[in-house]
């Protein structure tokens, strides 16, 4: 038995930040779980981990240097990512593992979300031109 995951097909990260919501066909309330976000078609890069263990407080970390936070809903985890680079535009997959109570459950691979990172506009707006550079 596998948990199903729904994600937005595409998100645009303005100002190098994005919120990605992972919606599960499973209620995470009072469960020990590990929700993670993975980058790339092969999910090779584990971007962020949100670990829940009954307590009210989620533990959040990244082994790959991503700046992230998370928020738990009954059947969802939202990942907040900051300081993304344009070259981190890629497909991102949500993963969920429920460790307790038994049986161990994980998810069918989702369709993923393409996160398109748009860089900050460094050029002055034509309406409000900044100081000219030599």
């Amino acid at each position: 038995n596998k948990i199903l995951v729904k994600q937005s097909p595409m998100l645009v990260a303005y100002d190098n930040a994005v919120n990605l919501s992972c919606k599960y066909s499973y209620n995470l309330f009072s469960r020990e779980f590990r929700a993670s976000l993975h980058k790339g078609l092969d999910s090779a890069v584990e971007v962020c981990v949100v670990y829940g263990n009954y307590s009210q407080q989620l533990q959040v970390y990244s082994k790959t240097g991503f700046n992230c936070d998370g928020k738990l809903g009954n059947e969802s985890v939202t990942f907040y990512l900051q300081n993304l680079y344009v070259n981190q535009t890629d497909i991102y997959f949500c993963k969920i593992e429920v460790m307790y109570p038994p049986p161990y459950l994980d998810n069918e691979k989702s369709n993923g979300t393409i996160i398109h990172v748009k860089g900050k506009h460094l050029c002055p707006s034509p309406l409000f031109p900044g100081p000219s550079k030599p």
Partner: antibody, heavy 120, light 107 residues
Framework: EVQLVESGGGLVQPGGSLRLSCAAS????????MHWVRQPPGKGLMWVSR????????SHADSVRDRFSISRDNAKNTLYLQLNGLRAEDTAVYYC?????????????WGQGALVTVSS | EIVLTQSPATLSLSPGERATLSCRAS??????LAWYQQKPGQAPRLLIF???KRATGIPARFSGSGSGTDFTLTISSLEPEDFAVYSC?????????FGQGTKVEIK
């Protein structure tokens, strides 16, 4: 005026526990992420733990993840750090610091620090 | 994690002189670098954030520059109260990390 005042430091034996507190005033405590940063004697600063504004998420440095826990009481404007399984290398001045909930890890105000000494 | 290397370790200067402190990151951190001042027995004080923006109440003699991997803190004319340890810190990658500090001492 923003004020952060740490307390609860002291001498503890290896393997022992301690609970640090940080009393905040002069700002809306529940609007800010809060952090603990430590400084071993004669060394540089090292980030330890953080908690988001409503206390729902936390993160810890790898070296303390299984031993330290961070919490906050927004009704009392107080931040806490529970230190368990203390080791000699945890000896340091522990500072609480605040960070805007949009920048997360930019520490604009710091407390004066609480000295934790781990020694037998 | 990102390593921040500060140089020099110690800078010996006289009041009125210009101080130039360097912080180099092991990989690009865009502009997400802050500088802190710390005096003995005192808490660190935020001077500069986002590489070049002065924090509230910080005198204009303090300025920051740089992006990517190389950053500089400049104190245009040292005042007696500026002799302290200066540390850089990045918030681009998790976990946030600090440099080991540069001590600015009176010559």
């Amino acid at each position: 005026e923003v004020q952060l005042v740490e307390s609860g430091g002291g001498l503890v034996q290896p393997g022992g526990s301690l609970r640090l507190s940080c009393a905040a005033s002069g700002f809306t405590f529940s609007d800010y992420w809060m952090h603990w940063v430590r400084q071993p004697p004669g060394k540089g600063l090292m980030w330890v733990s953080r908690i988001n504004s409503d206390g729902s998420t936390a993160s810890h440095a790898d070296s303390v993840r299984d031993r330290f826990s961070i919490s906050r009481d927004n009704a009392k404007n107080t931040l806490y750090l529970q230190l368990n399984g203390l080791r000699a290398e945890d000896t340091a001045v522990y500072y609480c610091a605040r960070a805007d909930s949009t920048t997360w890890y930019e520490f604009d105000f710091w407390g004066q620090g609480a000295l934790v000494t781990v020694s037998s | 994690e990102i390593v921040l290397t500060q140089s020099p370790a110690t800078l010996s200067l006289s009041p009125g002189e210009r101080a130039t402190l360097s912080c180099r990151a092991s990989q690009s951190i865009s502009i997400y670098l802050a500088w802190y001042q710390q005096k003995p027995g005192q808490a660190p004080r935020l001077l500069i954030f986002d590489a070049s923006k002065r924090a509230t109440g910080i005198p204009a003699r303090f300025s920051g520059s740089g992006s990517g991997t190389d950053f500089t803190l400049t104190i245009s004319s040292l005042e007696p109260e500026d002799f302290a340890v200066y540390s850089c810190q990045q918030r681009h990658n998790w976990p946030p990390t600090f440099g080991q500090g540069t001590k600015v001492e009176i010559k």
